[in-house]
Each structure stands twice: as C-alpha cells, then as structure tokens.
Interface confidence: low
C-alpha cells in the first residue's frame, strides 16, 4: 500500500511525526495495575509532540503506524526478588480504549532480571488510549533514565 | 509543537537524517568505564551520516530528537557468573560532554543475563557527545551482531 | 553522506518507508532452525508495505537503511527451563540470502530468561532475504504480543 | 588521497638500534578508525608485520620482535616511528609503514609507504 | 600464532585465463582475511578485505570468497598487469599474519 498522490506532496506538518517520549509519574491505587506517566520539558527529558495525556494514560492524536517502545526497572530488585514469587511481575502496553479495540500489544515479563525493554511497530487510530500494565507486587522504579515509555509516528 | 512554515517545505536534506550505527572499538584504561565505538563501511555494518566519532564517543551535529537504542553482551558469560557479582555489571548511556548538559538518558543492569537491549526518544542539541560507561569487572564482547550502540535523528 | 540533489525533492512514495511487523506462523521441520513469519490485516495487527514473504522470510524490495527489531518469548518457559540447558537457547537475526551477502545481524541468548528484545540499525539492499533462527530445543510463543519481528525503511 | 613517506637510515650496524619514521599526508594519525603499523620484508621472502600504535598511543607488537620494537607517534608532526633495537643481519629487509583499517582485535592495511631498505651489516 | 598457507607457490597461466589462488588458515578466521597484490619494487596493494569484499578502485574481475580456515582468490580474466605475486593476511587473531605469496607468471 503506497501514499497515494496526495499524501506525497504535502507539507511535513500533515505527515505527523507526532511523537512523546514519558516518565512515569506514580502506580495506580490497590487494584489499577496501570502506570501513570507524565511528560514536559519542565520534567527534565519528556515531552508531547502530538499525542497527549489524559489522567496518565497516553492517548493517540494522528492515525497512522507508530513505534512504541518501552522500558520498566523494578525499583529495590534483584534477581531472587523477581524469581522468588510463583506469579512473575509481568508488563502488558495495550490499547484500553476504545473498549472496541481494546487489544495487548506488548508484553514482557522479568522473571530473574529487574529490567525489560522492547519495541515494536503497531497501527494505531486517533482517540486510542495506551495503556502499560504492571502486575505483581514489585515496585517500578521513577529514575528518568530506568523508566520510560515513547510512540513515534513513522508512516500514515 | 508542530514545525514552523518554514521548516515543512524545505528538502529532506535539510531536515536532517542524521544516522549512526557503531561498533565496540575497544574498552577503555583501568579507571576509564567508557566504552569506545568505531563505524564505517570499512569495518562491516557500522557507518555514520551526520554524527562524528571524537576520540571513541559519539558527537552530535544537528539539533533534534533522536532514537538512541545500544545492545551489549558480555564475553565469556553465564548467568552465574553476572550474578555472583555482589555490584551487578551496569551499563548507562548519557551526555558527557559539555559537561553543563551532562545527563544519564538510559540505564540498565546485566542481573543474571549476558545481553542488555534498550532503546528511547531523547532530545539531542549540536555537540551533545554520548558516552556509554560500562561498570563492573566483565568485558563486553566485539562481535558486531552482539554488541553495538546507535542514534537516528526522528525530527526537529 | 547525504542525500543527493536529485534525491532531495522527489515525493515521499519514492523515498521508501517500506515497512512490515510479522508475527509467528510456524517453526521450521527439525533440522531447520528458522521461524516462519506471517502478516497481514487479517491475521491481526501485523503488515507488509514494501517488503515481501517468500516461503515465512521477509525479502527487501528497497535499499536503504533500516530499523530491524524484534521481540521472541519462549513458550511453556521459566528461568529454570532456560538455565537448564547447557547449550542456551540463542537467536540470531541474520541476512540468509543471496548467500553472497550472509551475515548475522543481531544475536541474542536467553540465558535465565524467556523473552529476547532488541533492534539495530544495518543497511539492507533489494533482494536481501531476512532469517531468524532459533537454536535450542525450547518453542517459542506464538501470542502476538509476546513475538514478533518488523523492519522499518530510515533513509537511504 | 593518503600518502604514507617512511624516512631513517638504510644501513644500521649489528647490535644497534634501528629508527625510522612514517610522514602521514592527507589524513591524520589523531583519527579514531586507524592503527598506525609497521610491516617488514626480507629480499626474496613474504611480509611480518611488526606492530601497530593508535591514536591514543596504545600499541601492539608481534611478539616474536616485543622485546626489542617500540612504536611511537607524534601528532603534532602527523608522523610515526619505528624503533628496533639490538639489530642483527636477520633484520635486513624492506620497512613498510601502513595505515591499519579495522579494529583493535586485527586490522587491514589499507594504505601503504613505498617502503625503505634497512641492511644491517658491520 | 595463525599459520596461512597458500598454494601454488607459483601459478602459470596465460592472459585472459581464470587464475584460483587458495590460503589455508591453520585455525579459523572467521572471515578476517585479506588478500593483497605485490608488483616487484613496489608495496602490496589491498584487494580484498573479510574474505569477499572488493577494496576501493579494484577491478571486478578480482573476488574473493571462504570462510573459517579456506580461502579462494580468483581473478576471472588475467590482465597482463596482473601477473605479480599475492599475499593473504588474517585479522582475526594477534599477531597478524601473512601467508608465504602465491606468484602468478605469465606462461
């Protein structure tokens, strides 16, 4: 599926290249798996170029493919932290809504390391909601440079 | 922030595209954490367009956001051997120099693995030079499909 | 190296952006180490705009530089079924074909864990046929978001 | 273009220490993808490479020769050299300078002086 | 140390015939090997850099091909320039290393 002729010849604006790059700003309460993120340049190195947030959770502005890529610490670990509970801390980034499109789109879990990264390519719509589960008891960690998470729009 | 007029009109050239894929050179002296890269066609798959190597690190030439994504594996590795370390193998990536905007943007520890992999959106200005300290007593591996760091400028 | 004049003003369809995200068909007979990939709208979220599957590997249709990433869990795994094993269980992402232009890529072992994620940057040309072996006896997962493999077309 | 000019003595006594310098042009020896080598060669017979110094100053040697070579560079003349000491008839060869492409694990060489005829011999 | 071996020691051959030089590695070398042309009174010239690709400015009748400890140069269609002696050298390991030459003479 190419551009078609007249998506080729205008300006970069109508292109997109939204893009944010988050910190993590606080866990949920006792029963929200769901991290909350935060961006701004008044945060140190986060921002929003398009998307936005709304109550912490990162909402898609552009239809289009975008890069999502995500990284978590787990704050006071070590290998036997992780590998001692029988259920292991896992991290799930869906969309979560619309409820009709709701789908995981990555997931991860730490097993006997305190860190996980990844990426991946997903088409995503104006108006989706992302959202980044972490399940088990650990805790992330806030450090700006062990934990984050970013979308880049890189083609309609 | 979108671009201004007079940004989304101008060829691509002038937009940047920055790109950088290097690999392990060498590690650095006994008190020296960094780890010191090298590109070029010459050498495999690594190159550099735009960005410069100064001395091993890499400089920045063109404001902009960047996607900067690292892999190091350890040599001669097991997981015994980076867990039986009581200060576990780290690797940070961040801005040396000048040293006003000196800032670690991307940490992680081995644990009981041999490979770390990561990835962020960061902005990067105009002779930003990152470094990648490498801490603890394990030495990174050289092959080019194991160990390598890079930056691609995404926007303005 | 930057783009030349010519390069410069064409429309956005003849600079690329070739993309793809695949997702996990089958593994290969037994003494085939490759995954097999598959994608397209119908099988979910995965896609092929530019490149091409032959026989579940991913063929180049435009030289350029890009992003290759991808993200393989093992199934029915925990970090004593990957530590286990006195051969790790390894993936590599390598160029299979033309067989004048083979080479491994990316490599990565799972050690005591059961997900592998990283990405590199590496020029690819026209024709150039993408594998990805997995070599050990453990299965990898087929969830959509625990594996899958993309290339993303950066620039020239 | 890069040239590479070796310069020093062509005759050496047995026992004495030989010296000889590299003169870089068009390019520079402060360059971070270079290793900066030393290569002989006896009349009649095949090439030893000697050693190597980076930029940075660190070098490598063929150990069959460590004891006895050193390698240094000064940037400030882009130039580097080339020291053998307690030479012996065996060491009668041509000296090739060249500049090493690679990496610090091994290297290609890429560019090369014309080289230079040392005779030892009393 | 890596010991290269290169054989023939001498190869004659007559312009515009196909000439296969081999170098033997006596561990392997991945595919860190070069391959470099040496003209008499002159400095060997690099051909062929990790076994398969070609050096900046050389002809494409020179390839190169192999890996691990068996390396094959082939020049496709002998020029009378050609006719010089070749030199395999490994990067792989320290020290570098040169095999003995293989001297291609005009039949």
């Known amino acids: 599926q190419r551009l078609s002729r007249a998506q080729q010849q205008l300006p970069l604006e109508s292109l997109g290249w939204d893009i944010a790059e988050l910190q993590l700003n606080h866990t949920g309460p006792q029963q929200d798996p769901r991290l909350y993120w935060q961006g701004g340049p008044a945060l140190g190195r986060s921002f929003l170029r398009g998307p936005e947030l709304d109550k912490g959770q990162l909402r898609i502005r552009r239809d289009g493919i975008y890069m999502v890529h995500i990284q978590v610490t787990l704050a006071i670990c070590s290998s036997t932290s992780t590998s001692r509970h029988h259920h292991p801390t896992t991290l799930a980034v869906g969309i979560c809504s619309p409820a009709s499109r709701s789908i995981s789109l990555l997931r991860l879990s730490f097993h006997q390391g305190c860190t996980i990264a990844s990426q991946r390519l997903t088409p995503l719509a104006r108006g989706d909601t992302l959202c980044t589960n972490l399940t088990g008891t650990l805790l992330p960690s806030r450090n700006t440079d062990e934990t984050f998470f970013g979308v880049q729009w890189v083609r309609p | 922030q979108r671009l201004s007029r007079a940004q989304q009109q101008l060829p691509l050239e002038s937009l940047g595209w920055d790109i950088a894929e290097l690999q392990l050179n060498h590690t650095g002296p006994q008190q020296d954490p960094r780890l010191y890269w090298q590109g070029g066609p010459a050498l495999g798959r690594s190159f550099l367009r735009g960005p410069e190597l100064d001395k091993g690190q890499l400089r920045i030439r063109r404001d902009g956001i960047y996607m900067v994504h690292i892999q190091v594996t350890l040599a001669i590795c097991s997981s015994t051997s980076t867990s039986r370390h009581h200060h576990p193998t780290t690797l940070a990536v961040g801005i040396c120099s000048p040293a006003s905007r000196s800032i670690s943007l991307l940490r992680l520890s081995f644990h009981q693995g041999c490979t770390i992999a990561s990835q962020r959106l960061t902005p990067l200005a105009r002779g930003d030079t990152l470094c990648t300290n490498l801490t603890g007593t394990l030495l990174p591996s050289r092959n080019t499909d194991e160990t390598f760091f890079g930056v691609q400028w995404v926007r303005p | 190296q930057r783009l030349s004049r010519a390069q410069q003003q064409l429309p956005l369809e003849s600079l690329g952006w070739d993309i793809a995200e695949l997702q996990l068909n089958h593994t290969g007979p037994q003494q085939d180490p490759r995954l097999y990939w598959q994608g397209g709208p119908a099988l979910g979220r995965s896609f092929l705009r530019g490149p091409e599957l032959d026989k579940g590997q991913l063929r180049i249709r435009r030289d350029g530089i890009y992003m290759v990433h991808i993200q393989v869990t093992l199934a029915i795994c925990s970090s004593t079924s990957t530590s286990r094993h006195h051969h790790p269980t390894t993936l590599a992402v390598g160029i299979c074909s033309p067989a004048s232009r083979s080479i491994s890529l990316l490599r990565l072992s799972f050690h005591q864990g059961c997900t592998i994620a990283s990405q590199r940057l590496t020029p690819l040309a026209r024709g150039d046929t993408l594998c990805t072996n997995l070599t050990g006896t453990l299965l990898p997962s087929r969830n959509t978001d625990e594996t899958f493999f993309g290339v993303q077309w950066v620039r020239p | 273009q890069v040239q590479l000019q070796e310069s020093g003595p062509g005759l050496v006594k047995p026992s004495e220490t030989l010296s000889l310098t590299c003169t870089v042009s068009?390019?520079?020896?402060?360059?971070?993808?270079?290793?900066w080598s030393w290569i002989r060669q006896p009349p009649g017979k095949g090439l030893e490479w000697l050693g190597y110094?980076?930029?940075?100053?660190?070098?490598n040697y063929n150990p069959s020769l460590k004891s006895r070579v050193t390698i240094s560079v000064d940037t400030s003349k882009n130039q580097f050299s080339l020291k053998l000491r307690s030479v012996t008839t065996a060491d009668t060869a041509v000296y090739y300078c060249?500049?090493?492409?690679?990496?610090?694990?091994?290297?290609?060489?890429?560019?090369w002086g014309q080289g230079t005829l040392v005779t030892v011999s009393s | 140390e890596i010991v290269l071996t290169q054989s023939p020691a001498t190869l004659s051959l007559s312009p515009g015939e196909r000439a296969t030089l081999s170098c033997r590695a006596s561990q392997s070398v991945s595919s860190y090997l070069a391959w470099y042309q040496q003209k008499p009174g002159q400095a060997p010239r690099l051909l062929i850099f990790d076994a398969s690709n070609r050096a900046t400015g050389i002809p494409a009748r020179f390839s190169g091909s192999g890996s691990g400890t068996d390396f094959t140069l082939t020049i496709s269609s002998l020029e009378p320039e050609d006719f010089a002696v070749y030199y395999c050298q490994q990067r792989s390991n320290w020290p570098l290393t040169f095999g003995g030459g293989t001297k291609v003479e005009i039949k």
């Open positions: 110094i980076y930029y940075s100053g660190s070098t």
């Open positions: 060249a500049r090493g492409d690679g990496d610090f694990m091994g290297v290609c060489f890429d560019y």
């Open positions: 068009g390019g520079s020896v402060s360059s971070d993808y270079y290793y």
